[in-house]
Interface confidence: low
């Protein structure tokens, strides 16, 4: 058992049919040492008296709000909470695999650029009784501070009959260098609970490798005479790190037919420029990735040929 | 051990009902998408429905209204009604799990049941 | 309707050829990449191959191995062994569920 937060406790259980379980000892808060009594959530069934209370827990109803009592009197309460480990494997029921990159990725993260600011988001199908806490750090054994805002419910979808919900929550390493080479990676951990179940899940990165840059902004066309080609041209995201001689970006240019079907052609350039032929019913798109560091591309931005 | 058994397949009349049982052990419906497949004699697999970890349901469009998917966590065992019988709905009829636990519907199938042959006759 | 198009729907090959069987779907797979493999043989459940497009399952020999992204994919078996002998399947997914589909099927027999 240890301290989540004040006056909140985890037990960590082996989760198999006939587990033993753990014996736990409460203590009340308070100097009185006789007339105490002991009840769990809302029953005012007396579980025991004394200033402890000895309790075998195995399973979630045996998890809950103890509240020791004198005399009418609410002495101190102590929330325990259940983390199952299954076959040696901690549970993970309240998100959702996301399964991208990779299979067993519950939280993805990104940044828009190098000043070490980045969003975190998981996804759940869990609608309420629901808490997620977040901590980070660089490096783990002399860790070095980031600032992590309160995760909040950020969309929901539907798919099929089921709702889905994610959650983001926003970070700042507190003395980022962002031309400096990245040694030590970013440790990310959300304490994530529902109803009497913790769950931990963590993540570890460079912001290098999360980086995904904003669409290229003001995409504009302009034909070229008597021909079908036209000089597309935009500008670097004003959330790119500067300066971009520096911190360059390289482009994917794509034209794209009306039917998914149909033949895409894609010109990639350094330059913040192209000329493409624009087919009819076409849209052109540009998209952008960082120079040097085959991080993810950006999400396209598009503008009709017509 | 994961397994998964089908059971209830049998000789049926035109426009009668069926329901198909998948019994299951060594995982939790209440944690894995479960399909059903059917399979018509020398023909391909054809996805009939699925239902989710956390109970919806979807199902190919020409199911939609004849077919029925349920489920009984606490039997452990997935149920498939079927309703208004034709003779091409005579296939062998399989239960598959979800690859993942809280697998999306359409993700990868595995296990699957061994199959119970439903044969609509008059 | 979603279509998934395998071709070919018959293929006869030798022990030791490279097979490729294509699978392509007219809309999108959910994510890219929500699309699998698998084998039967006749008689018995199909097997799972390949999920998430490219990634292995479980158990099954590296000379299988899957390709493709959005609405075109490929299994390819580098070197056909006597048990490849089968019938290959692909299943999409996609954003609505209900569109879960299985391509029509590729026989696999000795030349």
């Known amino acids: 058992i240890w301290e989540l937060k004040k006056d909140v406790y985890v037990v960590e259980l082996d989760w198999y049919p006939d587990a033993p379980g753990e014996m736990v000892v409460l203590t009340c808060d308070t100097p009185e040492e006789d007339g105490i009594t002991w009840t769990l959530d809302q029953s005012s069934e007396v579980l025991g008296s004394g200033k402890t209370l000895t309790i075998q827990v195995k399973e979630f109803g045996d998890a809950g709000q103890y509240t020791c009592h004198k005399g009418g009197e609410v002495l101190s309460h102590s929330l325990l909470l259940l983390h199952k480990k299954e076959d040696g494997i901690w549970s993970t029921d309240i998100l959702k695999d996301q399964k991208e990159p990779k299979n067993k990725t519950f939280l993805r993260c990104e940044a828009k650029n190098y000043s070490g600011r980045f969003t975190c988001w998981w996804l759940t199908t869990i609608s309420t009784d629901l808490t997620f806490s977040v901590k980070s750090s660089r490096g783990s054994s002399d860790p070095q501070g980031v600032t992590c805002g309160a995760a909040t419910l950020s969309a929901e979808r539907v798919r099929g009959d089921n709702k889905e919900y994610e959650y983001s929550v926003e970070c700042q390493e507190d003395s980022a260098c962002p031309a400096a080479e990245e040694s030590l990676p970013i440790e990310v951990m959300v304490d994530a609970v529902h109803k009497l179940k913790y769950e931990n899940y963590t993540s570890s990165f460079f912001i290098r490798d999360i980086i995904k840059p904003d669409p290229p902004k003001n995409l504009q066309l302009k034909p070229l005479k008597n021909s079908r080609q036209v000089e597309v041209s935009w500008e670097y995201p004003d959330t790119w790190s500067t300066p971009h001689s520096y911190f360059s970006l390289t482009f994917c240019v794509q034209v794209q037919g009306k039917s998914k079907r149909e033949k895409k052609d894609r010109v990639f350039t350094d330059k913040t420029s192209a000329t493409v032929i624009c087919r009819k019913n076409a849209s052109i798109s540009v998209r952008a990735q960082d120079r040097y560091y085959s991080s993810s591309w950006s999400e396209w931005a598009s503008v009709p040929c017509s | 051990e994961v397994q998964l058994v089908e059971s209830g397949g049998g000789l049926v009349q035109p426009g009668g009902s069926l329901r198909l049982s998948c019994t299951v052990s060594?995982?939790?419906?209440?944690?894995?998408?479960m399909n059903w497949v059917r399979q018509a004699p020398g023909k391909g697999l054809e996805w009939v429905g699925a239902?989710?970890?956390?109970?919806?349901?979807a199902y190919a469009n020409w199911a939609k209204g004849r077919f029925t998917i349920s489920r009984d966590n606490s039997k452990n065992t997935l149920y498939l009604q079927l309703n208004s019988l034709r003779a091409e709905d005579t296939a062998v009829y399989y239960c598959?799990?979800?690859?993942?636990?809280?697998?999306?519907?359409?993700?990868?199938?595995?296990?699957w049941g061994q199959g119970t042959l439903v044969t609509v006759s008059s | 309707d979603i279509q998934l198009t395998q071709s070919p729907s018959f293929l006869s090959a030798s022990v030791g050829d490279r097979v490729t069987i294509t699978c392509q779907s007219s809309q999108t797979v959910y994510k890219n990449n929500l699309l699998s493999w698998y084998q039967q043989k006749p008689g018995k459940a199909p097997k799972l191959l390949i999920y998430?497009?490219?990634t292995l399952a479980s158990g099954v020999p590296s000379r299988f191995s899957g390709s493709g992204s959005g609405t075109e994919f490929t299994l390819t078996i580098s070197s056909l062994q006597p048990e490849d002998f089968a019938t290959y399947y692909c299943?999409?997914?996609?954003?609505?569920?209900?569109?879960?589909?299985f391509g029509g099927g590729t026989k696999v027999e000795i030349k």
């Open positions: 060594g995982f939790s419906l209440s944690t894995y998408t």
């Open positions: 299943l999409g997914g996609y954003d609505d569920d209900a569109d879960t589909a």
């Open positions: 998430l497009a490219s």
């Open positions: 239902i989710s970890y956390d109970g919806g349901t």
């Open positions: 598959a799990r979800g690859f993942y636990v809280y697998a999306y519907i359409g993700d990868a199938f595995d296990p």
